[in-house]
């Protein structure tokens, strides 16, 4: 794909609360791949905000592809029932908020956050980097949004809306206005290069989010993190071209890459998904 090719696209008005994805790949377009098999799979549709069926060709494609509807929901919705705002003031937390913190079996010593059901607060813990459970958040804010109660004892909704205590209406929460090209791609693309724990010297590439380029580094052969690719092309494909562009007001914007138009206007802010 030539990065010089550009297309102009127009934003459509679909009033929805701000979309907050569990995994960046949930924003990827359903991709049947180049092969010709007919395999029933599921993908998360950012427009309808639901997991839907599609036909997969059997090879390539992308990570927004699941064997079952349940798996899709588990990966791309915060909680299988989390779109329903309760008529009571207390919105249910996802089940995983009640799991104990779990470091997993590996030795990464990564700072993460978990909801402590004893103290009713999100707390820091050291995650080993593998296994563990879903009560594991990269930021304190994300943990609080999903698992902690709001100030008046009601749950903050995953889309940044709260149930108004007076009239049971949805009230938008104040949101920071993000920059035009804020990075919202795979979170591992933002992590620094990590040699890992072993003694090998393997040539790898990592995405340097400061300069926006893939750079070589020496990998030890074990441990480290996901910002680790065997080729520059693979690094670029995963990190350079998969981010979400956000703008604060509607209008016309240019998006690189010749591919089908994919646009959705969100209330309070717009999310633009660049096709992978």
């Amino acid at each position: 794909d030539s990065e010089e090719d550009e297309e102009h696209t127009i934003i459509t008005d679909t009033e929805l609360p701000p979309l907050k994805l569990m995994h960046s790949f949930c924003a990827f377009k359903a991709d049947d791949g180049p092969c010709k098999a007919i395999m029933k799979r599921f993908f998360f549709n950012i427009f309808t905000r639901q997991c839907e069926e599609f036909i997969y060709g059997g090879c390539e494609g992308n990570q927004n592809r699941f064997e079952s509807l349940e798996e899709c929901k588990k990966m791309c919705t915060r909680d299988n029932a989390n779109r329903i705002i309760k008529t009571t003031l207390q919105q249910e937390k996802p089940d995983f908020c009640f799991l104990e913190e779990d470091p997993g079996i590996c030795r990464g010593y990564i700072t993460r956050y978990f909801y402590n059901n004893q103290t009713k607060q999100c707390e820091r813990f050291k995650y080993g980097g593998c296994l563990g459970n879903m009560n594991n958040f990269e930021t304190l804010e994300e943990c609080k949004n999903i698992c902690e109660d709001g100030p008046n004892g009601f749950q903050v909704d995953n889309y940044g809306t709260q149930l108004n205590a007076v009239n049971n209406s949805l009230t938008p929460q104040s949101t920071k206005v993000p920059s035009l090209f804020e990075f919202h791609g795979p979170s591992w693309c933002l992590t620094p290069a990590d040699r890992g724990l072993c003694r090998a010297n393997e040539n790898r590439f990592y995405y340097n989010s400061v300069i926006g380029k893939c750079r070589p580094f020496k990998y030890s052969g074990c441990g480290g993190n996901e910002n680790n690719f065997t080729s520059k092309q693979e690094c670029l494909r995963a990190c350079k071209k998969g981010f979400i562009q956000r703008i604060s007001k509607g209008g016309l914007i240019k998006t690189k890459r010749k591919r089908k138009k994919q646009r959705v206007k969100i209330a309070y802010e717009e999310i633009f998904v660049k096709n992978m």
């Epitope: 079996i105 296994l131 074990c222």
Partner: antibody
Framework: QVQLQQSGPGLVKPSQTLSLTCAIS??????????WSWIRQSPGRGLEWLGI?????????DYAVSVKSRITINPDTSKNQFSLQLNSVTPEDTAVYYC??????????WGQGTLVTVSS | DIVLTQSPATLSLSPGERATLSCRAS???????LAWYQQKPGQAPRLLIY??SRATGVPARFSGSGSGTDFTLTISSLEPEDFATYYC?????????FGQGTKVEIK
């Protein structure tokens, strides 16, 4: 050199409990750099991970959803071993059961395997 | 769950030939947490590769590569003792899962 020695019955009746033990030599069940697992293998299902225990300041476990309601893996620090209990077995639980050590690079040490047949 | 799909199911090759075994994951797997095992009839599996490193005592003809969702085990020149079944396994996220295996048989 780390070794794992499995013991337990090879025949279990349907609805009963399958119990196997894995004795560890050359490492400690309480090691903070290892984890201890049970895996089974049957012709129909291939290699199937059942569960894992590990000690990181306290004991943790994780079980496969397919057996979660029926499985318990327990450490025995005094004997330096760990055990598998699988309740309410059916003929589908017939398999070769392996215990294995996970040393953060994969399952690097395996027990010899125990063929468990569930039959009346 | 992360589903690991191995291909081909069977690989028929002669000693001295190069074997390339594929393991494709249904979701992202951290490459450090993908392992390869060799199993011979009547024996327990044996760890060969973790990430792209060889386990202790594994000959240099075995190598692992790949990242993301596509991983490869390569045996550069097959020896008679290499004819066996090979499994990939991930422990990036719970539950731990194995591929269904690739049998490398003598042609």
């Amino acid at each position: 050199q780390v070794q794992l020695q499995q013991s337990g019955p090879g025949l279990v009746k349907p609805s009963q409990t399958l119990s196997l033990t894995c004795a560890i030599s050359g490492d400690s069940v309480s090691s903070s750099s290892a984890a201890w697992s049970w895996i089974r293998q049957s012709p129909g299902r291939g290699l199937e991970w059942l569960g894992i225990i590990y000690y990181r300041s306290k004991w943790y476990n994780d079980y496969a959803v397919s057996v979660k309601s029926r499985i318990t893996i327990n450490p025995d620090t005094s004997k330096n071993q760990f055990s598998l209990q699988l309740n309410s077995v059916t003929p589908e639980d017939t398999a070769v059961y392996y215990c294995a050590r996970h040393s953060m690079v994969g399952f690097d040490v395996w027990g010899q395997g125990t063929l468990v047949t569930v039959s009346s | 769950d992360i589903v690991l799909t191995q291909s081909p199911a069977t690989l028929s090759l002669s000693p001295g030939e190069r074997a390339t075994l594929s393991c494709r994951a249904s979701q992202y797997v951290t490459s450090s947490y993908l392992a390869w095992y060799q199993q011979k009839p009547g024996q327990a599996p044996r760890l060969l590769i973790y990430g792209s490193s060889r386990a202790t005592g594994v000959p240099a003809r075995f190598s692992g590569s790949g990242s993301g969702t596509d991983f490869t085990l390569t045996i550069s020149s097959l020896e008679p003792e290499d004819f066996a079944t090979y499994y990939c396994q991930q422990y990036s996220s719970s539950p731990i899962t194995f591929g269904q295996g690739t049998k490398v048989e003598i042609k």
